[in-house]
């Protein structure tokens, strides 16, 4: 069971990143699915290595004081969303903006029907060029 | 099937990074090989988690306007090269240069004879000290 | 065999990061253990994908000239410690400090009783907020 999906620009104002099965994507079988273009949902309980990579372009003067944060989050059936992993990068002083890349990854126990998704502080800063931003998992 | 190879400084002017089976490297068996010191080639079709880490040292004034970009690329037999993953980091203002590290990783389907390699915008900026820059894969 | 442990602030002056089985941690079975809150020790020989993520907050003026470096290290029974992976990030000019995240990961052969741990240049700069700093492995 494995998946690798590709970032998709979205007009939605949500902080949850959108993904698509496009380009050189992976969806090994129907035991993992991309739901609503926003979350990877697994049918089998077990240990999974889950990862995300986010490239963004921001400028210190044009952004809030707070850093750019990417969060890998979990939603289990009937339960609240919770943070699994986070990474933070202070905005660049480069103009008009400076690109930076974040990589998150870890091993987690998922229940049947559990979904994982990626949140960012400012989705408008995310880079959607080929290969820059992606999200995936593999069952151990 | 797994491999982990170590960066090697090169006098070549190519943007493709060079690697070696040295130090604490891994080459599990002959189903994955390091070819010409530049690409990992697999003999079996299947899903692979492929990763690369690149540490580099650059300075904004001494570099081009464009950021430092590391790309994980795929060459399948009889096919064109294509980008699997990319990461970008704006150059540092630190002098003489500021070190930064990039990590790339994802799950991809590889065909028999497929090769993966790592490209960077400026190989002269890559750090080859112990542990700083490496490249590997594992078959799921 | 898999583990994922969570960073723990420590009053110790050591450069070795401290970890705990807390929050959304993973410890699949007793073939991998967290020893003295500082190292993951494996009982079985084999290939392991080992990873660490470190988020830190630093300022160029308040820090040494040297970059912030995170090192993934190995201690095998009866052998010296050695570096497996390193990543380096130059300190930010943001005030009071600028956050940055480092991700390390690779495939390594471990002997029975081998331990892996994470070293940083300045543990006081490490961010211990939920999800920011973690460490783990999985047996292939």
């Amino acid at each position: 069971i494995a998946a690798h999906v590709i970032s998709e620009a979205s007009s939605k104002t949500t902080s949850v990143l959108q993904w698509a099965e496009k380009g050189y994507y992976t969806m090994s079988n129907n035991l993992v699915t991309l739901e609503n273009g926003k979350q990877l949902t697994v049918k089998r309980q077990g240990l999974y290595y889950i990862y995300a990579q986010v490239t963004f372009c921001s400028n210190r003067e044009a952004s809030s004081q707070a850093p750019f944060i990417a969060s890998l989050c979990l939603k289990s059936p009937g339960r609240f969303e919770r943070i699994l992993l986070r990474a933070a990068n202070t905005h660049s002083s480069a103009k008009p903006c400076g690109q930076q890349s974040i990589h998150l990854g870890g091993v987690f126990e998922l229940q049947p029907g559990a979904s994982v998704f990626v949140n960012v502080t400012d989705p408008s800063q995310v880079s959607h060029g080929t290969g820059f931003t992606s999200f995936g998992l593999l069952k151990l | 099937i797994a491999a982990h190879v170590i960066s090697e400084a090169s006098s070549k002017t190519t943007s493709v990074l060079q690697w070696a089976e040295k130090g604490y490297y891994t080459m599990s068996n002959n189903l994955v090989t390091l070819e010409n010191g530049k690409q990992l080639t697999v003999k079996r079709q299947g899903l692979y988690y492929i990763y690369a880490q690149v540490t580099f040292c650059s300075n904004r004034e001494a570099s081009s306007q464009a950021p430092f970009i590391a790309s994980l690329c795929l060459k399948s037999p009889g096919r064109f090269e294509r980008i699997l993953l990319r990461a970008a980091n704006t150059h540092s203002s630190a002098k003489p240069c500021g070190q930064q590290s990039i990590h790339l990783g994802g799950v991809f389907e590889l065909q028999p004879g497929a090769s993966v390699f790592v490209n960077v915008t400026d190989p002269s900026q890559v750090s080859h000290g112990t542990g700083f820059t490496s490249f590997g894969l594992l078959k799921l | 065999i898999a583990a994922h442990v969570i960073s723990e602030a420590s009053s110790k002056t050591t450069s070795v990061l401290q970890w705990a089985e807390k929050g959304y941690y993973t410890m699949s079975n007793n073939l991998v253990t967290l020893e003295n809150g500082k190292q993951l020790t494996v009982k079985r020989q084999g290939l392991y994908y080992i990873y660490a993520q470190v988020t830190f907050c630093s300022n160029r003026e308040a820090s040494s000239q040297a970059p912030f470096i995170a090192s993934l290290c190995l201690k095998s029974p009866g052998r010296f410690e050695r570096i497996l992976l390193r990543a380096a990030n130059t300190h930010s000019s943001a005030k009071p400090c600028g956050q940055q995240s480092i991700h390390l990961g690779g495939v390594f052969e471990l002997q029975p009783g081998a331990s892996v741990f994470v070293n940083v240049t300045d543990p006081s700069q490490v961010s211990h907020g939920t999800g920011f700093t973690s460490f783990g492995l999985l047996k292939l």
Epitope: I83, E109 | - | I6, Y24, G129, T130
Partner: nanobody, 117 residues
Framework: EVQLLESGGGLVQPGGSLRLSCAAS????????MSWVRQAPGKGLEWVSG????????YYADSVKGRFTISRDNSKNTLYLQMNSLRAEDTAVYYC??????????WGQGTLVTVSS
């Protein structure tokens, strides 16, 4: 032995406030995400709120967001739920629950909150 002891429930008028407490013992409190879960009369369990071990990240069900505040004091091994702007539909038995890697493994005996005029 793990013990979770809730207190602070009672009868309150709509729009009023209550503060629930949960005293924990028998485990290392600051290593676990803690939650409040409730069960209204004749209904199933509903998760209300959760707080990470450090207390730096909190989670809320949409039905209580902006009205309830979860907090913890790790030095006292105590979990709290401040409930403001209470409504009749908040009437339930409130349980404190300890979580381990995604599952609740221990519950308290509960404290009854009744919102009625």
């Amino acid at each position: 032995e793990v013990q979770l002891l809730e207190s602070g429930g009672g009868l309150v008028q709509p729009g009023g406030s209550l503060r629930l407490s949960c005293a924990a013992s028998g485990f290392t409190f600051d290593k676990y995400l803690m939650s409040w879960v409730r069960q209204a009369p004749g209904k199933g369990l509903e998760w209300v709120s959760g707080i990470e071990p450090l207390g730096d990240v909190t989670y809320y069900a949409d039905s209580v967001k902006g009205r309830f505040t979860i907090s913890r004091d790790n030095s006292k091994n105590t979990l709290y739920l401040q409930m403001n702007s209470l409504r009749a539909e908040d009437t339930a038995v409130y349980y404190c629950a300890k979580e381990a890697s995604g599952d609740f493994d221990y519950w308290g005996q509960g404290t009854l909150v009744t919102v009625s005029s």
